[in-house]
Amino acid sequence: GSERTCCPVNWVEHERSCYWFSRSGKAWADADNYCRLEDAHLVVVTSWEEQKFVQHHIGPVNTWMGLHDQNGPWKWVDGTDYETGFKNWRPEQPDDWYGHGLGGGEDCAHFTDDGRWNDDVCQRPYRWVCETELDKASQEPPLL
């Protein structure tokens, strides 16, 4: 694989990672594909410090992150352990709400207008954030 030593143009470097913030909206799976085609992944939030950094850049806008439970348990797209990791859900979330009338529950996580997390219908066209780590050889992305 190839090694990244600096962030691409228009990406923001922070704590040895590079972040890219979309201007438009996509369904979660399409946003996931987009990041993968940048040899990156949807943002994985591992600390309060990283949460604040991302929140500062996205503002009060619903924005997808790399967390979903489409196959059962909640999983981060890069394999980071969900159970022991950082979480910032809104009160009473995630709730897998079925009342939206769109079919199914809510399997994809996003930042809400106050930065805290909510689970929502994966087809909603939200903005998204890609992340890639510096000094780490590119490798095949993990399967969902």
Epitope: P8, V9, D39, S138
Partner: antibody
Framework: QVQLVESGGGVVQPGRSLRLSCAAS????????MHWVRQAPGKGLEWVAI????????FYADSVKGRFTISRDNSKNTLYLQMNSLRAEDTAVYYC????????????????WGQGTTVTVSS | DIQMTQSPSSLSASVGDRVTIACQAS??????LNWYQQTPGKAPKVLIY???NLETGVPARFSGSGSGTDFTFTISSLQPEDIATYYC?????????FGGGTKVDIK
């Protein structure tokens, strides 16, 4: 100048394989995603596949999924399309196309096209 | 998949005429649209990207507009060298899809 030159086309029997190559020059190949696009005789354009700049991520049109494989060798500035189990409907001119840099065009755009190489699948 | 419907499929116009081609997407694609020109035996050439941005070196008589689902491509004053087939293409989501093409010729 920026250039993409395809090769490897030819006449092949149904069920057989063929590998197309695309030699890139005039730009930093390893910094760009790449596409293959095809055009059947007298028909419109059809997207075939895309690969990320480091080659770790690939996506395909349903019509070629499981039969075609896109790959790249950044040390040789070359893009490939391995075509297996070829069918008559794969007969087309195949174009190698560069994806513009993300800072210029958000999305899966196309900017520079090669001249194309012709693949004919016939018994 | 996003369907791209282009109209008309062909047109004839006189030199100097204003020519307009429409392209409709089956769902919102924001401004992620290219317009291409293809002459026989040649590769397509990008004229317009992001729906309305003129590619470097392309004459100013070509223009594009629109956002969301409805897009328009215009040649303000048709020239003999503009005889070609024109395609729209969305690059918002995979699979990438093209319009069926519009063949432009001179009356």
């Amino acid at each position: 100048q920026v250039q993409l030159v395809e090769s490897g086309g030819g006449v092949v029997q149904p069920g057989r394989s063929l590998r197309l190559s695309c030699a890139a020059s005039g730009f930093t190949f390893s910094s760009y995603g790449m596409h293959w696009v095809r055009q059947a005789p007298g028909k419109g354009l059809e997207w075939v596949a895309i690969i990320s700049y480091a080659g770790s991520t690939k996506f395909y049109a349903d019509s070629v999924k499981g039969r075609f494989t896109i790959s790249r060798d950044n040390s040789k500035n070359t893009l490939y399309l391995q075509m297996n189990s070829l069918r008559a409907e794969d007969t087309a001119v195949y174009y190698c196309v560069r994806r513009p840099p993300q800072w210029l065009v958000e999305g899966y755009g196309m900017d520079v096209w090669g001249q194309g190489t012709t693949v004919t699948v016939s018994s | 998949d996003i369907q791209m419907t282009q109209s008309p499929s062909s047109l004839s116009a006189s030199v100097g005429d204003r020519v307009t081609i429409a392209c409709q997407a089956s769902q919102d694609i924001s401004n992620y649209l290219n317009w291409y020109q293809q002459t026989p035996g040649k590769a397509p050439k990008v004229l317009i990207y992001d729906a309305s941005n003129l590619e470097t070196g392309v004459p100013a008589r070509f223009s594009g507009s629109g956002s969301g689902t409805d897009f328009t491509f215009t040649i303000s004053s048709l020239q003999p060298e503009d005889i070609a087939t024109y395609y729209c293409q969305q690059y918002d989501n995979l699979p990438l899809t093209f319009g069926g093409g519009t063949k432009v010729d001179i009356k």
